[in-house]
Interface confidence: medium
Amino acid sequence: QKKGAPHDLKCVTNNLQVWNCSWKAPSGTGRGTDYEVCIENRSRSCYQLEKTSIKIPALSHGDYEITINSLHDFGSSTSKFTLNEQNVSLIPDTPEILNLSADFSTSTLYLKWNDRGSVFPHRSNVIWEIKVLRKESMELVKLVTHNTTLNGKDTLHHWSWASDMPLECAIHFVEIRCYIDNLHFSGLEEWSDWSPVKNISWIPDSQTKVFPQDKVILVGSDITFCCVSQEKVLSALIGHTNCPLIHLDGENVAIKIRNISVSASSGTNVVFTTEDNIFGTVIFAGYPPDTPQQLNCETHDLKEIICSWNPGRVTALVGPRATSYTLVESFSGKYVRLKRAEAPTNESYQLLFQMLPNQEIYNFTLNAHNPLGRSQSTILVNITEKVYPHTPTSFKVKDINSTAVKLSWHLPGNFAKINFLCEIEIKKSNSVQEQRNVTIKGVENSSYLVALDKLNPYTLYTFRIRCSTETFWKWSKWSNKKQHLTTEASPSKGPDTWREWSSDGKNLIIYWKPLPINEANGKILSYNVSCSSDEETQSLSEIPDPQHKAEIRLDKNDYIISVVAKNSVGSSPPSKIASMEIPNDDLKIEQVVGMGKGILLTWHYDPNMTCDYVIKWCNSSRSEPCLMDWRKVPSNSTETVIESDEFRPGIRYNFFLYGCRNQGYQLLRSMIGYIEELAPIVAPNFTVEDTSADSILVKWEDIPVEELRGFLRGYLFYFGKGERDTSKMRVLESGRSDIKVKNITDISQKTLRIADLQGKTSYHLVLRAYTDGGVGPEKSMYVVTKENS
C-alpha cells in the first residue's frame, strides 16, 4: 500500500454472521473523504461509504482481495488487502448484568444476565468470567469462570456466590465478561469488554451492628464476622480469645476465625468493643445429625409402634437449632415428627406411630434434620415379630383346689392373632425356684387366665410372670410378685410312730413325730390314738398338737396301736404299730464308733423282716425308758447313717436295731457307741493296798462312763524313785531313764503288784486311763517301801 493510502484493515465479529471491518484513513485526509470498498468473491461487490468502517456478511473460507479506494479533494489512493477468516477477531458484545441481588441472611449474591444467544446462530460454548470486588477500593475477592452454551435464542443465566464475609460488612461489586469458543471459527477469539459494574450495599439499621447474627456453622469451618459502626472499634473477642482486626471501609472492621471449635449449648459469643459501646452476636458451631444408630421398631400392644434410636454423635445444637426427626412409613405415606428442644447425650430417642389396620409390614425411614444437614436410617419390620409385651399387671392368684391355682393378669393390647409364651416363676420358701412355660392364645380384651396344677397343699408360694410372643422378640418385664398360701388338704401320711414300755412294764408309751409340712398339708390340730386287739378297740381322747406322746395301760396281749393326724380338712391314714415285742435271747452289746457327725450302722439282709427296721437311740446316762429319737428304714436296707444335731463327742449313746415282722418288732442288735471318742476327763482313783520292803500292791476304781468319754482301752502306770516336795524330777518329766511304764490292756484288771523295789525308798506312782480318743489326766501318789527285815 502506498503511503497516504488506507491502511491497517482490521475485521471483528460479534456473531460470526457479520464482520465489522475498519481501517485507518490516509494521513492528511479530511472529513470529506469517500471510500469505495470492493470485495473480490464470485462476483465483485463494491460499496460507497463516507466512514472508515464497513459491515459485511461473513465470508466463507478462503482468501479474499479487498480493494479500498479513498476519494478526496486532492485525488485518490487505492489499497489492496487479503482478507481471510483467520484474520478476523471474534469479540462478543459487552454483556450486561440484568440483576444483582443479595440474601443477607446467607451472605449470598445472586446474579442474572442474558447471553443474547438469538444474535448468534451457531451453537457455541461460552466462557463467562465473573468478578466480585469488595470495599470502595474494589479489592478483588472472587474471579470465577462459568461455562454455558449458546443455542440460538436468548437465555437467562444465574450464578450465586456465598461470601466468606457477611454482605453487610462492605460494599460488593460484580462485573462479567465473556468469551465465545466456536469450533468452526478459525479466527482469533477474544474476551468481551467487562460489563458495567453493579453493586450491593447494606442500608444499616440502628439495631444490628455485628454480622452474621446467630449463625449456625459446622465445627472446623472458617468464618468472618464484622462490625458495622460509626465508632472506632478497639477490640474483638470470640469467647475469651482476642482476634486481630481487619479494617474495612470507614470504621467498619472484620475478624476471621479459622477452624472454629464446637460451641457450648448457649453458643459462642463474638464481641466488638468501642469506647462507648459493646456490639455482639452469637455463633453456634456444631455438627449435622449423625445417621441414627440402632433404629429399632417394636410394639407393646399391636396398637402403637415405638421406634427408638440412638442419635449418635452429639450435634451440640439445642433449642430451635436441635435435630428434628421425622419418621415416615412408605407403604402408607404416614409420618410422625419429633422436635426436640435439647439433645441429651447417648439417650435413646423414640417416636410413636399408630398401627394401621391390616398392615403388618412397615417400611420406616427416620429422617434427621438440623440447620447443618440431614441424615436418615431405614428399617423394614414385620411388626407381629417385634412384640415387646407390657409388664403384666393386676396379677392375681385364686384357689382352684389345694394343689391348683388360677393365675390371672392384664396385658394391654390387641393380640387376637398372636400366641403368647409366658414364663411363670414359682418359689417355695427354702426351696429351689421352679420355672413353668405356658402357651396361651392372645385375646382382644387384654385379660389372661391360666391354671397351675401340681402344687403342694398348705404351702406359701411366691408367683410372678412374664410373657413374650411365641416367636420371641423380647420378654416383658416381670410382673409384681404375688404370695399365696394354697388351701389345706387332708394329711397324706400318718405320723412316724414308735412305742416303748414304761420301766414298770405296765404302760405302753406311744411316740410320734410331727408330720413334715409336705405331708401335713395344713396345720395339724390334734392326733387320735387308738388301740385295738382281737376283742376290742379302745380310743384315747383327742391329743392336741404339739403333744407327740401318749401313754396307755395295757396287758401283755398283742395290740395294734393306731395314730391319726388331723387338720382342718380331715384325717391322715392311720400309722399302725404293734405293741408286741418278739423276744431275742442271744443278744450281745456291741461297741460302735461314729465318724464325727454321725454313726454308720450295718446289718445283714434278713428276708424275714417284712415291714421295716427301726433304729432308736438314747443317751446312755438317761433313765428308762431310753428314747432320744428313732429312724425307720425300709426292709430291704442293710445300712443307715444316723445323724442328729443333738449328738455330742464324748457322750455315750445306746443304739438299738429292731426288725419288724408280722407287725411285731424284735430287737436284733444292741449297741453302745460314740459319735467321736475323746480322752477321759478324769484319772482313775487308786490306793495302795499293801507295801513290803520290795513291793507295792496298787488297786483302782472304774471311771464313771460320763467321764470316760470313750471306750476304755487300758491304763498306763508309771513308777520311779521320787520324793514329794523336792526338786528331784517328777516321774512324767522327760529324760528319766529309771522310770518304768506298765501298759495294762486288760480293762477288767483292777490291781497291780510292783515288785523288785528297794527297801525304805520313796516311790512316785502315776496312773492314767486312755481311750481311742486319747490319754486322760494323771493321778499320782508317793509311797515309801518298808525296811528290809
Epitope: 445417621t291 441414627p292 444408630q293 440402632q294 433404629l295 429399632n296 403388618e360 436410617s377 431405614t378 428399617i379 423394614l380 414385620n382 407381629t384 415379630e385 400366641n419 411365641e470 416367636t471 420371641f472 422378640w473
Partner: antibody, heavy 116, light 110 residues
Framework: QVQLVESGGGVVQPGRSLRLSCVAS????????MNWVRQAPGKGLDWVTV????????YYADSVKGRFTISRDNSKNTLYLQMNSLRAEDTAMYYC?????????WGQGTLVTVSS | DIQMTQSPSTLSASVGDRVTITCRAS??????LAWYQQKPGKAPKLLIY???SLESGVPSRFSGSGSGTEFSFTISSLQPDDFATYYC????????????FGGGTKVEIK
C-alpha cells in the same frame, strides 16, 4: 446398592479356627438382626446362628454351640463368625443373611473347607 | 427341636404347569413359615413370609397357604425362570433348635 459381602473362607485343618466377616452396605445395618446360614456341598440350607440388631440376644444351632461365636460391629457395618474347633462336617458355603427371622437379603456366600 | 419335612424332594414339570410343594412341621408353628427359592451357585431368595404373604417384588404366580403344621407353596403357572430348589423355613422359635429349614424341593424340567 443394598448388599452383603462375605469373606474369610478358605481351607483349614480340623481343630483349627477361622473368622468370617460380612460387610453390609446400602441399608441401616444397626437396625437389623443378622444370621449365618450354611449349605454343605449338594445339601440343603442349615441355619447356624443369629444376633439381634443391638447384640443383646444370640442363638446358636446345637451343632455349633460352644464352638462358634457370632458378633457384630455396628460402627463398621460388619458381622462376624468366629469358628473354633472346626470339624469336617462344618465344610459348607456360609451365607450371611439379614433379618431376625425372615431372611430377606443374602450375601453371595464364602466357602469353608475343613480337611486334613 | 422343630423339624420341617418337605415333599416331594424332586418334582418334574413343564412350563405352564401348576406346581404345589408341601411342608410339614413336627409341632404347631402357627403361621410362622417362609419359602425361599435358590438357583444353582446363587444365594437363596425370600418369596413368601408368614405362610401366605408375598415378599415385595415377587411375581403373583407364587403363593403360600396353611397354618399349624401343614403348609403348601404353589406356582400357578410355571415359568422357565422358576426351575430351582425351594425351601420352607420355620421361624416360630429359636429355642432349643433355632430356625429350621425343610430339606428342599428341586423343581426340574420334565
Amino acid at each position: 446398592q443394598v448388599q452383603l459381602v462375605e469373606s474369610g473362607g478358605g481351607v483349614v485343618q480340623p481343630g483349627r479356627s477361622l473368622r468370617l466377616s460380612c460387610v453390609a452396605s446400602g441399608f441401616t445395618f444397626s437396625s437389623y438382626g443378622m444370621n449365618w446360614v450354611r449349605q454343605a456341598p449338594g445339601k440343603g440350607l442349615d441355619w447356624v446362628t443369629v444376633i439381634w440388631f443391638d447384640g443383646s440376644n444370640k442363638y446358636y444351632a446345637d451343632s455349633v454351640k460352644g464352638r462358634f461365636t457370632i458378633s457384630r460391629d455396628n460402627s463398621k457395618n460388619t458381622l462376624y463368625l468366629q469358628m473354633n474347633s472346626l470339624r469336617a462336617e462344618d465344610t459348607a458355603m456360609y451365607y450371611c443373611a439379614r433379618g431376625e427371622r425372615t431372611l430377606d437379603l443374602w450375601g453371595q456366600g464364602t466357602l469353608v473347607t475343613v480337611s486334613s | 427341636d422343630i423339624q420341617m419335612t418337605q415333599s416331594p424332594s424332586t418334582l418334574s414339570a413343564s412350563v405352564g404347569d401348576r406346581v404345589t410343594i408341601t411342608c410339614r412341621a413336627s409341632q404347631s408353628i402357627s403361621s410362622w413359615l417362609a419359602w425361599y427359592q435358590q438357583k444353582p451357585g446363587k444365594a437363596p431368595k425370600l418369596l413368601i413370609y408368614k405362610a401366605s404373604s408375598l415378599e415385595s417384588g415377587v411375581p403373583s404366580r407364587f403363593s403360600g397357604s396353611g397354618s399349624g403344621t401343614e403348609f403348601s407353596f404353589t406356582i400357578s403357572s410355571l415359568q422357565p425362570d422358576d426351575f430351582a430348589t425351594y425351601y420352607c423355613q420355620q421361624y416360630k422359635s429359636f429355642s432349643p433348635g433355632g430356625l429350621t429349614f425343610g430339606g428342599g424341593t428341586k423343581v426340574e424340567i420334565k
